[in-house]
Interface confidence: low
């Protein structure tokens, strides 16, 4: 896995480059889990949808994630997370049009109705971690990212390479 | 449709304790802060602390830490807030309210408001 | 921690005025919620995150600022809007204005 300065120094290099407009190499349609295994799941409330992470019970159906992935422009300097050298991101939607988001100012993950060509902070660095597990870094943001805080997503800052593999960062995705 | 259900009003001594309690429905309440607030007559309103139903993380302010407990019961969707060691300053309403969002941290509002319930201390 | 001011405390207006509260936060916040509470009520959502309307609010109601200084606009005051208005904003925890009573003139 790629060390935190290689991380940032990518995702920086992300930001002269527009790949909003790219379409993405593959899509994947997936469960999303903590490393702890409580599922990740989306509902319909207040008007607008809400993130949950939570024990299913065993009858209970996950929710499927499409993640969309797109091969970055920009060669990286080290290997181990990307195709080729070359780094990849997604796109996370749970249902039709609307996408996670990363709210950097309030530390919040979030989902927003939006339209093609998708903005910068609906894009997240993948990382292929230990234990068939993956984490999500923030394009926006680099050293931010995806975790679980008290049982809901938040956008969380990691600050040295050691905390890359720390579980609540970690997610594993699965086809059933 | 969402909605919090305190306890009746209560007089009490000083120094005794008052244990309020917030029920409610219409979501997923292990999912949700629930924050707890209070109103002295004619005053503006003053956050006493908040919890999580999910884990049972809660956060208390500064001036009530030590005389507040806050928690809650997933089994029935009702949260409670233990006031103790009573004075004659603690006479207010206090109010159960949950967040707008059950994830992020700062800037997730307060969306819903209990219908508050009266504590008056009195000898 | 921040703290929020709001003035002024408390204002006269007549039905089909104009008027402005603003809160001003002790350090820079990302966004700033508004809520109205009626004697003997408990407060209700008007605008959260600076200027989005809660459900149900009229469209006379308004928000707008950003860093320090936000303010609650009322473009034409309603019978129904004489109350109490109040701020709030803060990271880790709500943290709250002092309120402006809005009285009838």
């Known amino acids: 896995a790629f060390g935190i300065s290689g991380v940032q120094k990518y995702t920086r290099a992300l930001h002269d480059s527009s790949i909003t407009g790219i379409s993405p190499i593959t899509e994947y349609l997936a469960s999303l889990s903590t490393y702890n295994d409580q599922s990740i799941t989306f509902a319909l409330e207040d008007e607008s949808y809400e993130i949950y992470v939570e024990d299913l019970k065993k009858d209970e159906k996950k929710d499927k994630v499409l993640l969309s992935y797109y091969e970055s422009q920009h060669p990286s300097n080290e290997s181990g997370d990307g195709v080729d050298g070359k780094m990849l991101m997604v796109t996370l939607s749970p249902t039709k049009d609307f996408w996670l988001h990363a709210n950097n100012k309030e530390h919040s993950v979030e989902l927003h109705k939006c339209e093609k060509p998708l903005p910068d902070q609906a894009f997240f660095v993948l990382h292929n971690m230990h234990s068939n597990c993956v984490s999500f870094e923030c394009k926006t943001d680099p050293g931010v990212f995806i975790g679980v805080k008290d049982n809901h997503l938040a956008l969380i800052k990691v600050d040295s390479s050691e905390n890359l593999c720390t579980e609540n960062i970690l997610f594993k995705l699965s086809e059933t | 449709e969402v909605q919090l259900v305190q306890s009746g009003a209560e007089v009490k001594k000083p120094g005794a304790s008052v244990k309020v309690s917030c029920k409610a429905s219409?979501?997923?309440?292990?999912?949700?802060?629930i924050q707890w607030v209070r109103q002295a007559p004619g005053q503006g309103l003053e956050w006493m602390g908040e919890?999580?139903?999910?884990?049972?993380?809660?956060y208390y302010s500064e001036k009530f830490k030590g005389r507040v407990t806050m928690t809650t019961d997933t089994s029935t969707s009702t949260a409670y807030m233990e006031l103790r060691s009573l004075r004659s300053d603690d006479t207010a309403v206090y109010y159960c309210?949950?967040?707008?969002?059950?994830?992020?941290?700062?800037?997730?509002?307060?969306?819903?408001w209990g219908q508050g319930t009266l504590v008056t201390v009195s000898s | 921690d921040i703290q929020l001011t709001q003035s002024p405390s408390s204002v006269s207006a007549s039905v089909g005025d104009r008027v402005t509260i603003t809160c001003s936060a002790t350090?820079?916040?990302?966004?700033m919620h508004w809520h109205q509470q009626k004697p003997g009520k408990a407060p209700k959502l008007l605008i959260y995150?600076?200027?989005n309307l809660a459900s149900g609010v009229p469209s006379r109601f308004s928000g707008s600022g950003s860093g320090t200084d936000y303010t609650l606009t009322i473009s034409s005051l309603q019978p129904e809007d004489f109350a109490t208005y109040y701020c709030?904003?803060?990271?880790?925890?709500?943290?709250f204005g002092g309120g402006t009573k809005v009285e009838i003139k």
């Open positions: 219409g979501f997923r309440f292990k999912n949700y802060w």
């Open positions: 709030s904003g803060g990271y880790s925890h709500p943290t």
């Open positions: 995150r600076t200027s």
């Open positions: 350090s820079s916040v990302s966004s």
């Open positions: 309210a949950r967040k707008h969002r059950g994830y992020g941290y700062g800037g997730a509002w307060i969306a819903y």
């Open positions: 919890i999580f139903p999910g884990t049972g993380t809660s």
